[in-house]
Interface confidence: medium
């Protein structure tokens, strides 16, 4: 029985780290630069690294710029967006910025989108400074279940900030659903 | 066999209650308000309590100003950094501020530092109003290795605010790496 | 004995992942914008949803406008605040405000009110622009025992956004308390 | 109608000086970029120097430390001093508001003047 209890336990510790890490999506998604989207108006952000630098993923898939659940879980989501000016680059269009991020939750079935969190500022970028910032940080604990996809949606995405630290977005899974 | 596997299950829920919080590192430290370097420059912060009032620490070391990583795993890192100024305690050097955090990890067997999350804003603090205040929140998920170090880096350091519930950091390992 | 470690193994799945359900309380709470209080003082907000829209509890107790800790343990604790003021709405009393979230815990044992986390910025809303906005985020980790209440505080309710992807508030445990 | 128009240039011995101005009118020259650009016969136009509302300068590596760039908003005009002058600054100046862009970058730029020549003799 000695031997048996010891194939138990050892059975179960593998059985218990398995599930462990397969009950645990992640993803945190960096913004990539090179396909950045013009223009002050709002736009859906597509294009983003899964798997270079600190972006990763895992038990989730990146695709068509949406991070698709693929495991059913309370998850909690976070967002963190920076906007950047320099004198050098160019006149705003405006100084009056209303600098804006939404992260949605789309569902295949129902195809509808659905903004789960906001964050953001209105600003007045005036010329008489060669440089500006504004960063904007959300998060929140969401149910999810499979096949639901989370995008990010901003307001003058020319300002966006491309470093890697700078704008991402991401997701890990808390617990089950009851 | 029911005594056995009464056993089994005993010795099972200590094992997994405590590999689950061996499993859990985590840390949340407070600003150290003695010691908060003045001037208006980027400064890595240095002085942080972990064990007074909201701050605190487990499987996880705070040294030299940062805290150092004894356990592999994806941590959720988090960082709560508030500036403010009133009029009562001198002029600004510049109205035109930029209050930045960094978040950076250092590797020693690679000696070199990395920005894992900033955020901030450029501020105009105009000497019409009495006091200005201004907060900064980031946070996400990164794989973190037994050894690294993360640490707090800001602007103007003069002007942090010294509460343990304005300008704190912390981490929280959330699952092992696979 | 193979179908006593089949059961072992059985029993133990249901175990482990019945405590590990019971063992995570969390709750989002959002917004009740038919309730808001009017004025720019602080005050505590005592409104929120807990069962419609994003908003959801579990192994915790919303009442009274505070969210009770069921169980002891480590929890990530975060608030997402907006506000918001568009010039048909009327002029504001000010154009120089104080935007503010206090997260606060109250133990009953010790009937005193600590502010755990606080966040915000001061605003010039000059009546230049036709609309204004401004978030905060804050989030960190805590140790909060059973009993215990965490509640919200603003400046300027009357300015709240009332959408429920703009002004919530959650919590959700991570962990025991060794 | 908005109008850009240079003077001060001319002929001087190269190690010499000039100040060259451009008065803007029908634009508020407070609320652009002012620029001042240079053109060789057969070359393409190219930045020399450029005074945004924040009241930073930016040069061209060929005229830093030698040429200036001011505004003066009260008067709408923007200045360019140019010291130490060599042969090879001989070129048409131009003045020019920026619309939206890159500071350097002529392509940026919505008004522009006719032209002052500035020629400098070894």
């Known amino acids: 029985i000695r031997a048996e209890k010891a194939m138990v336990d050892g059975s179960w510790l593998d059985l218990a780290k398995r599930s462990k890490l397969e009950a645990q999506p992640f993803a945190h998604l960096t913004i990539n630069a090179t396909d950045i989207p013009s223009g002050s108006h709002k736009v859906s952000l597509s294009s983003w690294y899964h798997d270079r630098g600190w972006a990763k993923i895992s038990n989730m898939t990146f695709s068509n710029g949406k991070l698709i659940v693929n495991q059913d879980g309370f998850y909690y989501l976070y967002a963190n967006i920076c906007f950047r000016h320099h004198e050098t680059s160019g006149d705003l269009a405006t100084e009056y910025l209303q600098l804006m991020v939404y992260v949605t939750k789309t569902s295949i079935k129902i195809p509808s989108s659905h903004t789960l969190m906001k964050g953001g500022s209105t600003k007045y970028w005036s010329g008489n400074s060669e440089f500006h910032f504004y960063s904007i940080n959300v998060g929140g604990f969401f149910k999810l279940r499979s096949g639901e996809e989370i995008s990010i949606e901003v307001s003058n995405p020319s300002l966006l900030d491309p470093d890697q630290d700078a704008t991402y977005f991401g997701a890990f899974k808390v617990r089950d659903i009851d | 066999i029911r005594a056995e596997k009464a056993m089994v299950d005993g010795s099972w829920l200590d094992l997994a209650k405590r590999s689950k919080l061996e499993a859990q590192p985590f840390a949340h430290l407070t600003i150290n308000a003695t010691d908060i370097p003045s001037g208006s420059h980027k400064v890595s912060l240095s002085s942080w309590y972990h064990d007074r009032g909201w701050a605190k620490i487990s499987n996880m070391t705070f040294s030299n100003g940062k805290l150092i990583v004894n356990q592999d795993g994806f941590y959720y890192l988090y960082a709560n950094i508030c500036f403010r100024h009133h009029e009562t305690s001198g002029d600004l050097a510049t109205e035109y501020l930029q209050l930045m955090v960094y978040v950076t990890k250092t590797s020693i067997k690679i000696p070199s530092s990395h920005t894992l999350m900033k955020g901030g804003s450029t501020k105009y603090w105009s000497g019409n109003s009495e006091f200005h205040f201004y907060s900064i929140n980031v946070g996400g998920f990164f794989k973190l290795r037994s050894g690294e170090e993360i640490s707090i880096e800001v602007s103007n350091p003069s002007l942090l605010d010294p509460d343990q519930d304005a300008t704190y950091f912390g981490a929280f390992k959330v699952r092992d790496i696979d | 004995i193979r179908a006593e470690k089949a059961m072992v193994d059985g029993s133990w799945l249901d175990l482990a992942k019945r405590s590990k359900l019971e063992a995570q309380p969390f709750a989002h709470l959002t917004i009740n914008a038919t309730d808001i209080p009017s004025g720019s003082h602080k005050v505590s907000l005592s409104s929120w949803y807990h069962d419609r829209g994003w908003a959801k509890i579990s192994n915790m107790t919303f009442s009274n406008g505070k969210l009770i800790v069921n169980q002891d343990g480590f929890y990530y604790l975060y608030a997402n605040i907006c506000f918001r003021h568009h010039e048909t709405s009327g002029d504001l009393a000010t154009e120089y405000l104080q935007l503010m979230v206090y997260v606060t815990k109250t133990s009953i044992k010790i009937p005193s009110s600590h502010t755990l986390m606080k966040g915000g910025s001061t605003k010039y809303w000059s009546g230049n622009s036709e609309f204004h906005f401004y978030s905060i985020n804050v989030g960190g980790f805590f140790k909060l025992r059973s009993g215990e209440e965490i509640s919200i505080e603003v400046s300027n309710p009357s300015l709240l956004d009332p959408d429920q992807d703009a002004t919530y508030f959650g919590a959700f445990k991570v962990r025991d308390i060794d | 109608e908005v109008q850009l128009v240079e003077s001060g240039g001319g002929l001087v011995q190269a190690g010499g000086s000039l100040r060259l101005s451009c008065a803007a009118s029908g634009l508020t020259s407070s609320r652009y970029t002012m620029s001042w650009f240079r053109q060789d016969p057969g070359k393409e136009r190219e930045f020399v120097a450029a005074?945004?509302?924040?009241?930073?300068?930016y040069y061209a590596d060929p005229v830093r430390g030698r040429f200036t760039i001011s505004r003066d908003n009260a008067k709408n005009t923007v200045d360019l001093q140019m010291n130490s002058l060599k042969p090879e600054d001989t070129a048409v100046y131009y003045c020019?508001?920026?619309?939206?862009?890159?500071?350097?970058?002529?392509?940026?730029?919505?008004?522009w003047g006719q032209g002052t020549q500035v020629t400098v003799s070894s």
């Open positions: 020019a508001a920026r619309a939206s862009g890159s500071i350097f970058n002529r392509g940026s730029y919505a008004y």
């Open positions: 005074v945004p509302l924040s009241g930073n300068t």
